[in-house]
C-alpha cells in the first residue's frame, strides 16, 4: 500500500532542525499538511499546495517554514529549536485516489553535557566531585588507579528539562592519591568523554 517514509531527528537546543516526509507514490499529493501531535487533537502548523502556496498558522509564523516545497517530498525546518518543540509531527499528504496518507517524524532535543570536576580535602579523607548537566540525563562513571573506592550519586531534574548527575568519590586515604590521576567519564547519547583530574596536596 501507499506509504510515507520519515526519519526521526535529534538536534541540539537552540539550533535549526529539519523533518522530512516522502510520499512513496507515483503521484504527487494535492496538498501537504504538517501537524504537531497533541494529547487531545493534532495542531495544524503549515500547509503547502499549488493553489495557495505555503500557509503558516500564526502560532508558528516565526518558528518554522517549509524548506522543501514539494507535494511528494516535504521538509519543515525549525529555525531555533526549544524544548517545547520536542515531540512528534505528522505530515499528511492528501492524494487523489487514496485520500490522506500520513507519516510521523519525531524530534528530540538534546543539550550537550556541561561538566565540572573538582576535589576537596577533609582531615582524613578526600572527596572528588564530578557533576554533569545535560539532556537526556547523562551517566557518570569513575576510572581510578585502584578498586574499592566508594562513590555516591545524586540525580536532580531541572525545570528547563536538563538533568544534573553528581557523583562523589570518597577516598579514605588521601595521601596515596596525591599526584595520581582520576578520570570522570561522562556517557551521553552513546559518547563517552573523559575528564581528568590530578590530585595535588593543597
Amino acid at each position: 500500500q501507499v506509504q510515507v517514509v520519515t526519519q526521526d531527528e535529534r538536534e541540539q537546543l537552540y539550533t535549526p532542525a529539519s523533518l522530512k516526509c516522502s510520499l512513496q507514490n507515483a503521484q504527487e499529493a494535492l496538498i501537504v499538511t504538517w501537524q504537531k501531535k497533541k494529547a487531545v487533537s493534532p495542531e495544524n502548523m503549515v500547509t503547502f499546495s499549488e493553489n495557495h502556496g505555503v500557509v503558516i498558522q500564526p502560532a508558528y509564523k516565526d518558528k518554522i517554514n517549509i524548506t522543501q516545497l514539494g507535494l511528494q517530498n516535504s521538509t519543515i525546518t525549525f529555525w531555533n529549536i526549544t524544548l517545547e518543540d520536542e515531540g512528534c509531527y505528522m505530515c499528511l499528504f492528501n492524494t487523489f485516489g487514496f485520500g490522506k496518507i500520513s507519516g510521523t517524524a519525531c524530534l528530540t532535543v538534546y543539550v550537550q553535557p556541561i561538566v565540572s570536576l573538582h576535589y576537596k580535602f577533609s582531615e582524613d579523607h578526600l572527596n572528588i566531585t564530578c557533576s554533569a548537566t545535560a539532556r537526556p540525563a547523562p551517566m557518570v562513571f569513575w576510572k581510578v588507579p585502584r578498586s574499592g573506592i566508594e562513590n555516591s550519586t545524586v540525580t536532580l531534574s531541572h525545570p528547563n528539562g536538563t538533568t544534573s548527575v553528581t557523583s562523589i568519590l570518597h577516598i579514605k586515604d588521601p595521601k596515596n592519591q596525591v599526584g595520581k590521576e582520576v578520570i570522570c567519564q561522562v556517557l551521553h547519547l552513546g559518547t563517552v568523554t573523559d575528564f581528568k583530574q590530578t590530585v595535588n596536596k593543597g
Partner: antibody, heavy 117, light 107 residues
Framework: QVQLVQSGAEVKKPGASVKVSCKAS????????ILWVRQAPGQRLEWMGH????????NYNLKFKGRVTITVDTSASTAYMELSSLRSEDTAVYYC??????????WGQGTLVTVSS | DIQMTQSPSSLSASVGDRVTITCKAS??????LSWFQQKPGKAPKSLIY???RLVDGVPSRFSGSGSGTDFTLTISSLQPEDFAIYYC?????????FGQGTKLEIK
C-alpha cells in the same frame, strides 16, 4: 500517441463474472492512475474504483460490496476490471481512463457489458 | 456519500449564447471538482479540473469557478460542437460521485 484500448463487448448471464481489459500505450504505464467508471443506459456516470500501477494500490467504491477487483499487469501495460456476481442492473458501458493526480486526459472507448438471462 | 446536484437538468440554447451550469455538493468539497463533456455513444471528455483549471486542448470559452459547495461551468459563446451532456465530479471524499448531468440542446 497515448491510447487506452479496451476489450470488446460482452454478454453475460446473471451470477457470472466479467473481466474487462484496458491496454495502455504511448506513455509510461506506472506514471498514471487507471480509473474505472461505468454508465448504465440513461444513467449518470458512476465511479467504480482505481489503481496506482506503481505500487498496485487500489481503492474501490464500497457500493459494489467486494464484487469489483481492479488489477494491473505492468509488463503488458494493461489494467483489468473484474466484476463478479453480475445482475441485470450491471448492464452498462464500462470506461477506463488515466489520471495524473486529478488531471484526467485520456479515456478508453468503452466496453458494453450486457447481463441477461 | 457526497451528493452532487446539477441544475438545470436540461437546457436549450443557441449558438453564440453564454451558458452557465451549476453543481451543488451536499457538503464542503474544497476545490476538488471536475467537469466533463459527453456526446452520445462516446467516452466522457475532461474539461476542467480542480474547479477552475482548464485541461490542455480545451477551448478557452470554457471556464469553471466556485469552491466549497457551489460550482459553475460557463461556456462564454456556444459553438455547434458544444451541444452535449455535462457532468460534474467531486473527488474530495471517497467514493467519488458525479452529478446527474445537464443536457445542453440546440434551441
Amino acid at each position: 500517441q497515448v491510447q487506452l484500448v479496451q476489450s470488446g463487448a460482452e454478454v453475460k448471464k446473471p451470477g457470472a463474472s466479467v473481466k474487462v481489459s484496458c491496454k495502455a500505450s504511448g506513455y509510461s504505464f506506472t506514471d498514471y492512475i487507471i480509473l474505472w467508471v461505468r454508465q448504465a443506459p440513461g444513467q449518470r456516470l458512476e465511479w467504480m474504483g482505481h489503481i496506482d500501477p506503481y505500487y498496485g494500490s487500489s481503492n474501490y467504491n464500497l457500493k459494489f460490496k467486494g464484487r469489483v477487483t481492479i488489477t494491473v499487469d505492468t509488463s503488458a501495460s494493461t489494467a483489468y476490471m473484474e466484476l463478479s456476481s453480475l445482475r441485470s442492473e450491471d448492464t452498462a458501458v464500462y470506461y477506463c481512463a488515466r489520471s495524473k493526480r486529478d488531471y484526467f486526459d485520456y479515456w478508453g472507448q468503452g466496453t458494453l457489458v450486457t447481463v441477461s438471462s | 456519500d457526497i451528493q452532487m446536484t446539477q441544475s438545470p437538468s436540461s437546457l436549450s440554447a443557441s449558438v453564440g449564447d453564454r451558458v452557465t451550469i451549476t453543481c451543488k455538493a451536499s457538503q464542503d468539497i474544497n476545490s476538488y471538482l471536475s467537469w466533463f463533456q459527453q456526446k452520445p455513444g462516446k467516452a466522457p471528455k475532461s474539461l476542467i479540473y480542480r474547479a477552475n483549471r482548464l485541461v490542455d486542448g480545451v477551448p478557452s470559452r470554457f471556464s469553471g469557478s466556485g469552491s466549497g459547495t457551489d460550482f459553475t461551468l460557463t461556456i462564454s459563446s456556444l459553438q455547434p460542437e458544444d451541444f452535449a451532456i455535462y457532468y460534474c465530479l467531486q473527488y474530495d471524499e471517497f467514493p467519488y460521485t458525479f452529478g446527474q448531468g445537464t443536457k445542453l440542446e440546440i434551441k
